[in-house]
């Protein structure tokens, strides 16, 4: 039994890091393998992650981590019974994929303005809380070509757009994702989308 593709890990910089790897043949990851991980720090304890299958030869493990900060570094040991298959390390702050924003809401009752709001996925004492920027994707259910991205580079988790920039009388969907420049993160997954019917009064022609 050998590792074909070494584990690669990403962290949500809060409580979970996800590691994926591939074996050289079909493997029952949960019964045959264990991923041991330990913070390189005074008094830290070793933890065991039981991997799940991710395709025939692929495995995935969700590592639970407390109080993740930029100085943290973890040792990783992949075991098959008594055999050490792979040894490595992982620094969560260097491989961050933020959590997806939540609670995306479209407020249509503001005069001819659409207000989109969502929730920051991190608590205020997490470093990423004040460093997330967002991309909002709005698209028409009727017209695949009517697809737009708004970059929200300020900290406020909201976006105002004039209803008139979208077509009236049709349904739209929106979703939002996040990233943080400070840690050179990847983009988060998209939030669940929300749907609304866009209608506004055309201005009277003089």
């Amino acid at each position: 039994m050998k590792v074909l593709q070494e584990p690669t890990c990403v962290s949500d910089y809060m409580s979970i890091s996800t590691c994926e790897w591939k074996m050289n043949g079909p493997t029952n990851c949960s019964t045959e393998l264990r991923l041991l991980y330990q913070l390189v720090f005074l008094l830290s304890e070793a933890h065991t992650c039981i991997p799940e299958n991710n395709g025939g030869a692929g495995c995935v493990c969700h590592l639970l981590m407390d109080d993740v900060v930029s100085a943290d570094n973890y040792t990783l040991d992949l075991w098959a019974g008594q055999q050490l298959l792979w040894k490595g390390s992982f620094k969560p702050s260097e491989h961050v994929k933020p959590r997806a924003p939540g609670n995306l809401t479209v407020h249509t009752n503001v005069s001819d303005t659409l207000l989109l709001t969502w929730s920051n996925p991190y608590p205020p004492d997490n470093y990423l809380y004040n460093h997330l920027t967002y991309a909002v994707n709005i698209w028409s259910e009727n017209d695949p070509a009517d697809f737009r991205i708004y970059n929200v580079t300020y900290l406020e988790p909201s976006l105002r757009i004039a209803a008139s920039t979208l077509k009236s009388g049709i349904s739209y969907r929106a979703r939002v994702r996040a990233w943080a420049q400070c840690y050179n993160t990847t983009w988060s997954e998209w939030s669940p989308s929300t749907k609304w019917h866009n209608s506004y009064r055309e201005p009277f022609e003089q």
Partner: antibody, heavy 116, light 111 residues
């Protein structure tokens, strides 16, 4: 929000022991390390030791080895620091502080006065 | 005994900029992250800077940190009277054993 509430001021005689408590609230108690540091009057900060509330393991500064004991009670989310064989040089404000490499949350401090 | 050296005192007028240095060695600052703490009179220390140059939520951007080799610097711009306090640097030392250490402390006076 995170709060670390320490016990009140103590006056002790030389040779006695003191036990200072630090009650945590507003977060998952076992998920964060707790340090103890002290500050003598007009002096700087001095690290005493650390406890991992999850398993209760400890590490102490060499200077305090054999005199300090740190414990925790997970049922009340409280950590304790006991210092024995007190001498006048132990007169200081004792702080608990939450964190690993740096300490974002501190207790208000407990003044321990050692005087005959 | 602290192995991080800071100037005992610095002073400047309101609105000015001041810097506080913290000098260590290869077994501490040279090999670890630096944090800075502000201690107002009669209160507990407060985290100002961590990870060499990051500010916790609620700390104004007048405060900044940097690190080069075995020394670190805290800079405060637009000085206010409320900034008058003691400032401590902190890091981890690996010799002879892993442990946190603090600087000797610097008293900032706003003239």
């Amino acid at each position: 929000q995170v709060q670390l509430v320490q016990s009140g001021a103590e006056v002790k005689k030389p040779g006695a022991s003191v036990k200072v408590s630090c009650k945590a609230s507003g977060y998952a108690f076992t998920s964060y390390y707790m340090h103890w540091a002290r500050q003598a009057p007009g002096q700087g900060l001095e690290w005493m030791g650390i406890i991992n509330p999850s398993g209760g393991s400890t590490s102490y500064a060499q200077k305090f080895q054999g005199r300090v004991t740190m414990t925790r009670d997970t049922s009340t989310s409280t950590v304790y620091m006991e210092l024995s064989s007190l001498r006048s040089e132990d007169t200081a404000v004792y702080y608990c502080a939450r964190g690993k490499w740096w300490w974002q949350h501190w207790g208000k401090g407990t003044l321990v006065t050692v005087s005959s | 005994q602290s192995v991080l050296t800071q100037p005992p005192s610095v002073s400047a007028a309101p609105g000015q900029k001041v810097t506080i240095s913290c000098s260590g060695g290869s077994s501490n600052i040279g090999n670890s992250y630096v944090s800075w703490y502000q201690q107002l009179p009669g209160t507990a220390p407060k985290l100002l800077i961590y990870d060499n140059n990051k500010r916790p939520s609620g700390i104004p951007d007048r405060f900044s940190g940097s690190k080069s080799g075995t020394s670190a610097t805290l800079a405060i711009t637009g000085l206010q009277t409320g900034d008058e306090a003691d400032y401590y640097c902190g890091t981890w030392d690996t010799s002879p054993v892993d442990r946190p250490i603090f600087g000797t402390g610097t008293k900032l006076t706003v003239l």
